[in-house]
Amino acid sequence: QQQTLPKPFIWAEPHFMVPKEKQVTICCQGNYGAVEYQLHFEGSLFAVDRPKPPERINKVKFYIPDMNSRMAGQYSCIYRVGELWSEPSNLLDLVVTEMYDTPTLSVHPGPEVISGEKVTFYCRLDTATSMFLLLKEGRSSHVQRGYGKVQAEFPLGPVTTAHRGTYRCFGSYNNHAWSFPSEPVKLLVTGDIENTSLAPEDPTFPADTWGTYLLTTETGLQKDHALWDHTAQNLLR
């Protein structure tokens, strides 16, 4: 006999990276008939929602109107049907950005390289941080971690046309509190025409996660898109 219900899905809309003082919605999708959902934050109960009517709703949304460093961290949710509770969802890492300062991103030997060349990004931030994050724009938001007192280097190795795209970096004050994003650096990788045509910027995930993040940054608009990013989420753990 089943002792627990299947775990729900959890994600953040429009993005798990939230500029401070902006809003974010945490979504939890369980089953029709669930009478209560609980959102937990760092192991403590954060919020409760009781859908009405439960038999017609399988997803709830928890609204955070004013993101700050106290609310950055790991979230999970559970739901209840009758007296039976579900397994907890996977962890959602909610990150607050635009904290303190703006790093500088540079690339060596330069932003225009030939396929096969070795490329290194440098992210510099003079304030107290030792962890840096390099993100490539696009749905998959490829994230790399680097460490250093005021600067981290991110060697990409011999590049291919798949490395083409726009990069930004963050300084990280802890796993869930990041600086303002750096100015973007666009990497152009030239190769033979055949390869170039077969290598769009981000072939696996064409939807633009970064665009959604920028929309949040600039206007605070909410978008009803499930853009939770597994690549970056896993890297945070």
Partner: nanobody, 127 residues
């Protein structure tokens, strides 16, 4: 901007009752989830009770369940905390808090979620 003003605190004997009120200014009260927290001398602020924006769903700390009742009157922009069977351990400064705006059924338990706070009202329970 939301301003919250608590009232109704005072001294009461064990087993007695009090009703706290929290008056909210501004037109946003109907879109606010509300909560009560308390802080006893030398202790951390703790959750007491909360109520959702629209349907009036409620949630209580185990320590007050069955003794305290939270309610709201959207016409009066006021949230109430009816406290009965009071005990010495209920002695604390009671704070009203709001999350504005929010979805209809959300009930917030964690203090970090609340973006507006009142100044507090003191409740003392002693013989």
């Amino acid at each position: 901007e939301v301003q919250l003003v608590e009232s109704g605190g005072g001294e009461v004997q064990p087993g007695g009752s009090l009703r706290l009120s929290c008056a909210a200014s501004g037109r946003t009260f109907a879109s606010a989830a509300m909560g009560w927290f308390r802080q006893a001398p030398g202790k951390e602020r703790e959750f007491v009770a909360a109520i959702s924006r629209s349907v009036g769903d409620t949630y209580y700390a185990d320590s007050v369940k069955g003794r305290f009742t939270i309610s709201r009157d959207n016409a009066k922009n006021t949230v109430y905390l009816q406290m009965s069977s009071l005990r010495a351990e209920d002695t604390a400064v009671y704070y009203c808090a709001a999350v504005v705006p929010t979805y209809g059924n959300n009930i917030y338990v964690h203090s970090a979620a609340y973006n507006y706070w009142g100044q507090g009202t003191l409740v003392t329970v002693k013989p």
